[in-house]
C-alpha cells in the first residue's frame, strides 16, 4: 500500500506581501505525475482556481495581474495524479499593502541613540487602527506586532527598545491594520533610519521565540527587553 501523495510546495513571486495594484504569481509545485493543480482560498468556494501543469508537469502557475483586497488571504494548493489528490500544501498567506493611508513613524527621544540607552519607535495613524507592525529593512519577519486587547482602536503604538545595541541600527517602517483582516495592511510609513552610536556594546539581544529562516542572525526578530507595550495593545508574534 503506497502512502499518501507528498504535499506540494506553494509560494508567491515576487513575494507574499504585495502592494495594491502590483502583479503577483502564485506557484504550486508537485510531482512529475501531476495531471492538474487546484488552488483553494480560505473562506472562498473551492476550488478557487484550477490550472493544468506547465511542462515538465511538476508545477502550475496562478496569475494575479493586479493585486486587490479580494486576493488577500490564505491559500493552499493540491495536485491530482493518477492515484488521486495530494495532501494540501502548507498555507500561503498573501498580504496586501496599500489598503489604508500610511502611518507616521518617529523615534523618541531621537533617531540618533547611544548604545546601551533606550529608544521608543512610535507608529501613529491618522484614523484609529487596532494592529501595528514594525518592520526592519532586510529582516525576514515583522519585528513586532502590536494588537489591541479588546478591539479597542488606537491612533498609535509604541515599540520600546532597551538597551539599544548596534544590532538595532537600521531602517524601519511601520504598517497599521484593522483586526477584521490582518491580510490587509496600510501603505508603509516613510522610512526611519535608527542610528546607534558609541561603543557601549552589550550582549546581543536574543529573540524570545526562535524563527526558522535561512537568513542570518540579523534577520531574526528583535524583542526589546524590559519594555511595556503601549496601553491597550498587547504584544503578539505572527
Amino acid at each position: 500500500q503506497a502512502g499518501p501523495l507528498p504535499k506540494p510546495t506553494l509560494w508567491a513571486e515576487p513575494g507574499s506581501v504585495i502592494s495594491w495594484g502590483n502583479s503577483v504569481t502564485i506557484w504550486c509545485q508537485g510531482t512529475l505525475e501531476a495531471r492538474e493543480y487546484r488552488l483553494d482560498k480560505e473562506e472562498s468556494p473551492a476550488p478557487w482556481d484550477r490550472q493544468n501543469p506547465l511542462e515538465p508537469k511538476n508545477k502550475a502557475r496562478f496569475s494575479i495581474p493586479s493585486m486587490t483586497e479580494d486576493y488577500a488571504g490564505r491559500y493552499r494548493c493540491y495536485y491530482r495524479s493518477p492515484v488521486g489528490w495530494s495532501q494540501p500544501s502548507d498555507p500561503l498567506e498573501l498580504v496586501m499593502t496599500g489598503a489604508y493611508s500610511k502611518p507616521t513613524l518617529s523615534a523618541l527621544p531621537s533617531p540618533l541613540v547611544t548604545s546601551g540607552k533606550s529608544v521608543t519607535l512610535l507608529c501613529q495613524s491618522r484614523s484609529p487602527m487596532d494592529t501595528f507592525l514594525l518592520i526592519k529593512e532586510r529582516a525576514a519577519h515583522p519585528l513586532l506586532h502590536l494588537r489591541s486587547e479588546h478591539g479597542a482602536q488606537q491612533h498609535q503604538a509604541e515599540f520600546p527598545m532597551s538597551p539599544v545595541t548596534s544590532v538595532h541600527g537600521g531602517t524601519y517602517r511601520c504598517f497599521s491594520s484593522h483586526g477584521f483582516s490582518h491580510y490587509l495592511l496600510s501603505h508603509p510609513s516613510d522610512p526611519l533610519e535608527l542610528i546607534v552610536s558609541g561603543s557601549l556594546e552589550g550582549p546581543r539581544p536574543s529573540p524570545t521565540r526562535s524563527v526558522s529562516t535561512a537568513a542570518g542572525p540579523e534577520d531574526q526578530p528583535l524583542m526589546p527587553t524590559g519594555s511595556v507595550p503601549h496601553s491597550g495593545l498587547r504584544r503578539h508574534w505572527e
Epitope: 502590483n22 496569475s63 495581474p65 493586479s66 479580494d70 496599500g98
Partner: antibody, heavy 123, light 107 residues
Framework: QLQLQESGPGLVNPSKTLSLTCNVS????????WSWIRQPPGKGLEWIGY???????NYHPSLQSRVTISVDTSKNLFSLKLTSVTAADTAVYYC?????????????????WGHGTTVTVSS | DIQMTQSPSSLSASVGDRVTITCRAS??????LAWYQQKPGKVPKLLIY???TLQSGVPSRFSGTGSGTDFTLTISSLQPEDVATYYC?????????FGQGTKVEIK
C-alpha cells in the same frame, strides 16, 4: 449586457479642467478596474489611469499631477478630471473595464469599451 | 516604466496571407499582455488576453504567443475585414502601457 457611455463637454478652454463621466449600465461595478484611455487625433492609444471599486487608483506617471479618477458605485458611474489642459490633451476619451478578480470572468484585457467622446482644447 | 515596442509600424499583405506582429516589453511582464484591434473610426476591441487566450467571439485565425518580454500576434489567413490598427498592452502593474500600434492594410 454591460454598456459604458462617456459624457462631458466637447470643448474645454486651455488651462481649465476637463471633466468626463462614464455611466455603467447593465452590470455591477464590483471587482473590476474602471479605466480611462485617450487617443489624440491620428495617434495611438494612451492609458490615463484606473480606479477599483474600493476607490484605489493608479495613474499614468506623465499625467499623475493633473489627473483624478473617482467612482460612485451607488450611481454606477466613474469620472475623470484633468486639470490645466492644453491643446496636447485634445483627444477621443474612452472609458473601459478590466476584470479584477477571478470571480468576474475575464481578468485580462479591457473587454468592454465606451463609444468614446471627442474633447477639443481650444479657446 | 516598462516600454512596449511594436513592429512593424505598418504592413501590407494579400488576402489569405499569414501576418505576424511582434510586441516587445523592455522588462519581463510574464503573460500579462493583451492585443486589441481598432478599425478606422471605431472603438478598440479586445482580441487576446493573457498573451494567448482568445477573447470570446474572436475568430480563430487570430492567435497570440509569448511570455516575458517577447510576444506575437498572428493572423493565420488575412481577411479584408482585418484591415485595422493592432495594439498590444501590458496590464500587470501600472502603468498599463500600450504599444504604438501596427497598421495592417490589404495589398
Amino acid at each position: 449586457q454591460l454598456q459604458l457611455q462617456e459624457s462631458g463637454p466637447g470643448l474645454v478652454n486651455p488651462s481649465k479642467t476637463l471633466s468626463l463621466t462614464c455611466n455603467v449600465s447593465g452590470g455591477s461595478m464590483s471587482n473590476y478596474f474602471w479605466s480611462w484611455i485617450r487617443q489624440p487625433p491620428g495617434k495611438g492609444l494612451e492609458w490615463i489611469g484606473y480606479i477599483y471599486n474600493s476607490g484605489n487608483t493608479n495613474y499614468h506617471p506623465s499625467l499623475q499631477s493633473r489627473v483624478t479618477i473617482s467612482v460612485d458605485t451607488s450611481k454606477n458611474l466613474f469620472s475623470l478630471k484633468l486639470t490645466s489642459v492644453t491643446a496636447a490633451d485634445t483627444a477621443v476619451y474612452y472609458c473601459a473595464r478590466r476584470g479584477g478578480y477571478y470571480g468576474s470572468g475575464n481578468y485580462g484585457g479591457l473587454d468592454v469599451w465606451g463609444h468614446g467622446t471627442t474633447v477639443t482644447v481650444s479657446s | 516604466d516598462i516600454q512596449m515596442t511594436q513592429s512593424p509600424s505598418s504592413l501590407s499583405a494579400s488576402v489569405g496571407d499569414r501576418v505576424t506582429i511582434t510586441c516587445r516589453a523592455s522588462q519581463g511582464i510574464s503573460n500579462y499582455l493583451a492585443w486589441y484591434q481598432q478599425k478606422p473610426g471605431k472603438v478598440p476591441k479586445l482580441l487576446i488576453y493573457a498573451a494567448s487566450t482568445l477573447q470570446s467571439g474572436v475568430p480563430s485565425r487570430f492567435s497570440g504567443t509569448g511570455s516575458g518580454t517577447d510576444f506575437t500576434l498572428t493572423i493565420s489567413s488575412l481577411q479584408p475585414e482585418d484591415v485595422a490598427t493592432y495594439y498590444c498592452q501590458k496590464y500587470d502593474s501600472a502603468p498599463w502601457t500600450f504599444g504604438q500600434g501596427t497598421k495592417v492594410e490589404i495589398k
